[in-house]
């Protein structure tokens, strides 16, 4: 069962949200829903794994309710009719607080983890492979919905029909209710690996806004900077690294380094003092030749939030900023699995790192 590489995340989707799950649900698929429960309005929210966009066929309805002391309802809807509710009388969510909600699809059940602790298992009532859509509604603001597939032995790349020269995008920041499949880079099957999401919210006073929802304050600590973490299994074709954060108002420079031992295999260095995005490699403390060309204007802006998506392919890294392909960087260090450390430093505040 060789699954393709993971679907690109939906970033800051507006609620209510419906989005396609590319390839449908598969045994071993992990879906992470990251957001904040709104404190002001409503007493419920729901995450639904469903067939199509109508909402008549929901394989798994996960529905926290801030009523009667708080409880969570799990259910299935078939042809518009709800089955018997399964209730969990513990409420792991808090109004006004962020949460990390992970769903693992397995052959017999959905497992649900909330804030790092297994919360509930829900045994399938209908075949899960019918599910092709995730929807979220109710009193919640979303930061992202991400997908992580299981992977097996490498095979020849199954290249997509999208030519590499075309710009490819993250899912758009949704304005409407329904999301069609996003245009993404081709993703290749790869060895089994582990995605690690390192999540903390931005610091006091930092806002993260979307077109459809007013900015919200996140009074939570930022990542310690510089931020250093291991990339489990190193790089390989189809490996993705996702970072988001905010450029400090007085920023001069920041950097994202992918390292192999003492070498910097990939140095991504936005420089506001030079209005440039510099890329380079450092081997044995010696820098190579810089790459600076961009297809459009400098995408990073002082004081503004950003997302960076780095996709490793056989011959190069592809880098997208704010959902738009920006450049390719051909590997100078070609022993990809040894590139196993991410270092981020400089004049930014990180809000999310997924390796």
């Amino acid at each position: 069962m060789a699954f393709s590489g993971s679907q690109a995340p939906y970033l800051s989707p507006a609620v209510p949200f419906s989005g396609t799950i590319q390839g449908g649900l598969q045994d071993g698929l992990q879906i992470t829903v990251n957001g904040t429960v709104l404190s002001s309005s409503g007493t419920r929210f729901a995450v639904n794994f469903q067939t199509g966009f109508s909402g008549n066929d929901i394989a798994f309805h996960f529905n926290p309710r801030f009523e009667d002391g708080g409880y969570v309802v799990c259910n299935t809807r078939q042809n518009g009719s709800w089955g018997p509710e399964e209730r969990k009388t513990h409420m792991p969510f808090q109004k006004g607080m962020p949460f990390d909600l992970c769903f693992l699809v397995q052959s017999s059940d959905f497992k649900v983890m909330v804030n790092g602790i297994l919360f509930v298992q829900y045994f399938h009532r209908v075949p899960f492979h019918r599910v092709d859509t995730i929807s979220v509604n109710g009193s919640v603001q979303l930061s992202y919905i991400s997908f992580q597939n299981p992977r097996t032995v490498p095979v020849q790349p199954a290249f997509s029909t999208v030519p590499f020269s075309q710009p490819v995008c993250f899912p758009p920041r949704p304005r409407g209710r329904r999301q069609k499949p996003p245009g993404v880079w081709p993703a290749n099957p790869a060895p089994i690996t582990q995605t690690v999401i390192h999540t903390v919210q931005s610091a006091p006073g930092q806002m993260f806004s979307t077109p459809a929802i007013p900015p919200m304050m996140y009074p939570h600590p930022a990542y310690p900077m510089p931020f250093i973490t291991t990339i489990l299994g190193g790089l390989y074709p189809s490996k993705s690294i996702l970072l988001s954060g905010t450029v400090l108002p007085s920023a001069q420079r920041f950097h994202i380094n992918l390292c192999s031992g003492n070498h910097i295999a990939f140095h991504l260095n936005p420089r506001f003092d030079e209005n440039a995005v510099v890329r380079n490699t450092q081997i044995d403390n010696s820098w190579g030749s810089e790459e600076r060309s961009l297809p459009r204007k400098m995408p990073f802006v002082r004081g503004q939030s950003f997302s960076v998506w780095i996709l490793c392919e056989a011959h190069c890294l592809k880098v997208a900023v704010d959902g738009q392909h920006l450049f390719e960087y051909y590997h100078r260090l070609r022993n990809l699995p040894t590139i196993n450390r991410l270092e981020v430093g400089g004049d930014i505040q990180l809000t999310h790192v997924q390796t």
Epitope: Q30, P92, F99, D100, I117, L118, Q121
Partner: antibody, heavy 121, light 109 residues
Framework: EVQLVESGGGLVQPGGSLRLSCAAS????????IHWVRQAPGKGLEWVAY????????SYADSVKGRFTISADTSKNTAYLQMNSLRAEDTAVYYC??????????????WGQGTLVTVSS | DIQMTQSPSSLSASVGDRVTITCRAS??????VAWYQQKPGKAPKLLIY???SLYSGVPSRFSGSRSGTDFTLTISSLQPEDFATYYC???????????FGQGTKVEIK
């Protein structure tokens, strides 16, 4: 190398307070949940509290609820256990432990060496 | 609260013996069970996570299994360094999201 180092234990009178620290290195506490587990002399392990720093989510054992507060300072990469209204039965070695950072892996993979808290008059 | 009832509380065995320790959860905890080894004056060490997965660096003579709400730690051939106390632990969200078993002390016969 991942390491957890507890500090702050000692002798305190009943009704008193102590703050335990758990300094982490080799990983960021923001990417894990951190748990405090205690062990009274000659007894078994008792879970005390946990924090998931990203969502400021925390939970406590019934025996310490309302008296103990767990927190984390991600800039210092340190977790804390503030213990108030201490009782003789709180006497124990207190361990901090990291719950595995890998999703769907259930287990505390790194532990500190422990710090002894003695509540006695 | 979810209770983890561990048995036996102690056992005596010889080097080379096969040793089995069980934990029964008072309700379903899926596979969210770990096993630890603790020696006097030391912190616990993770042996088995997610009910049946061997933690890195742990000898293969240790194994874990699950049958419904019953969880078993097996040491296939007891070694001198295995004399210690063993604990099971569940992490399934309840009023107390983490609970430990009472422990099993494995002593030399």
């Amino acid at each position: 190398e991942v390491q957890l180092v507890e500090s702050g234990g000692g002798l305190v009178q009943p009704g008193g307070s102590l703050r335990l620290s758990c300094a982490a290195s080799g990983f960021t506490v923001s990417s894990s949940s951190i748990h405090w587990v205690r062990q009274a002399p000659g007894k078994g392990l008792e879970w005390v509290a946990y924090i998931y720093p990203y969502s400021s989510s925390s939970s406590y054992a019934d025996s310490v609820k309302g008296r103990f507060t767990i927190s984390a300072d991600t800039s210092k990469n340190t977790a804390y256990l503030q213990m108030n209204s201490l009782r003789a039965e709180d006497t124990a070695v207190y361990y901090c432990a990291r719950y595995s950072t890998y999703k769907w892996v259930w287990g505390m993979d790194y532990w500190g060496q422990g710090t002894l808290v003695t509540v006695s008059s | 609260d979810i209770q983890m009832t561990q048995s036996p509380s102690s056992l005596s065995a010889s080097v080379g013996d096969r040793v089995t320790i069980t934990c029964r959860a008072s309700q379903s905890v899926s596979s969210a069970v770990a096993w630890y080894q603790q020696k006097p004056g030391k912190a616990p060490k993770l042996l088995i996570y997610s009910a049946s997965s061997l933690y890195s660096g742990v000898p293969s003579r240790f194994s874990g299994s699950r049958s419904g709400t019953d969880f078993t730690l097996t040491i296939s051939s007891l070694q001198p360094e295995d004399f210690a106390t063993y604990y099971c632990q569940q992490s399934y969200y309840d009023s107390n999201p983490i609970t430990f078993g009472q422990g099993t002390k494995v002593e030399i016969k």
